[in-house]
Amino acid sequence: MAVTACQGLGFVVSLIGIAGIIAATCMDQWSTQDLYNNPVTAVFNYQGLWRSCVRESSGFTECRGYFTLLGLPAMLQAVRALMIVGIVLGAIGLLVSIFALKCIRIGSMEDSAKANMTLTSGIMFIVSGLCAIAGVSVFANMLVTNFWMSTANMYTGMGGMVQTVQTRYTFGAALFVGWVAGGLTLIGGVMMCIACRGLAPEETNYKAVSYHASGHSVAYKPGGFKASTGFGSNTKNKKIYDGGARTEDEVQSYPSKHDYV
């Protein structure tokens, strides 16, 4: 019961996390800026992974997509890649984990197969969460290192001047959504991996034969070699040795100095 609950909760937590990663990836508010030097109106600029928007206090808002791929900063491309990989892995993980759920019966799927699928989905969720956390962290680092800089003046070759606009760059809502979502996906993945241990069968299903010698002398029955190799008449794994040979199913054997395996 605890295993089912852990698996189910892990699935739900991962589902919420992946939904959050998708939301964060699509959001425009990855970085937000207040443009200080504008004497006209309060101008609020916010940017996402796919487009940049300008909003004015007058209510005017305009967004423009980054239509080029080659000209964009490498860091932005890296963040996009990490988030997309996170979403893809998470989606596959969700698909796998649906079939792995203990409460869902699909044909005669064994617990060992479900355990393997649970572990696979758990690992996928963990990697997915790590990708999202890494992507958001790389972007946050890019903001901190590249943009919290003092105003600098430069001169163009044409004689006109260009200066960086003094802006206050702040972390957008998408960064926090991404961090939380990545964390949830990671936690969900860990829960799935924990559930996998409970799903995995404790004992092996094959019948091992242990041979317990009752005395110091072991009587050898003819045909024993044939039986051990699977040839000859003794192919039913019959007891070959006299004196206490039992299958695991028949008796619990305790190790002694006279055990022969």
Epitope: V54, R64, Y66, T167
Partner: nanobody, 122 residues
Framework: QVQLVESGGGLVQPGGSLRLSCAAS????????MGWYRQAPGKQRELVAV???????NYTDSVKGRFTISRDNAKNTVYLQMNSLKPEDTAVYYC????????????????WGQGTLVTVSS
């Protein structure tokens, strides 16, 4: 690279009119505010008029009611219609634009033109 090219300056009599235009070109991603500043001989550069992408305009007190700023977002161009010109309007008029570059859409830059001279004299 980005270029801001002003045109329309020249010599005009007091009470006359001039229309300045400034076209921005180059690897521009998005232009936010565009404006006009002026610098009279021996004085500091001052704001004349500025207009945001949404069309909100602001003017310095001395030109209110006489100057009109407008812009064409599609052409990345800003205009300054100057009416009832006075001798104290004589200055070099500079175009100014806050913009992003295509190569770096996360950073804002203020670009300036080289200026166009407006002389109001009889």
């Amino acid at each position: 690279q980005v270029q801001l090219v002003e045109s329309g300056g020249g010599l005009v009599q007091p009470g006359g009119s001039l229309r300045l235009s400034c076209a921005a070109s180059g690897s521009i991603f998005l232009i936010n505010a565009m404006g006009w500043y002026r610098q009279a001989p021996g004085k500091q550069r001052e704001l004349v008029a500025v207009i945001t992408r949404g069309g909100s305009a602001n003017y310095t007190d001395s030109v209110k009611g006489r100057f009109t700023i407008s812009r064409d977002n599609a052409k990345n161009t800003v205009y300054l219609q100057m009416n009832s010109l006075k001798p104290e309007d004589t200055a070099v008029y500079y175009c100014n634009a806050d913009l992003n570059l295509r190569s770096d859409p996360f950073k804002w830059y203020t670009f300036w033109g080289q200026g166009t001279l407006v002389t109001v004299s009889s």
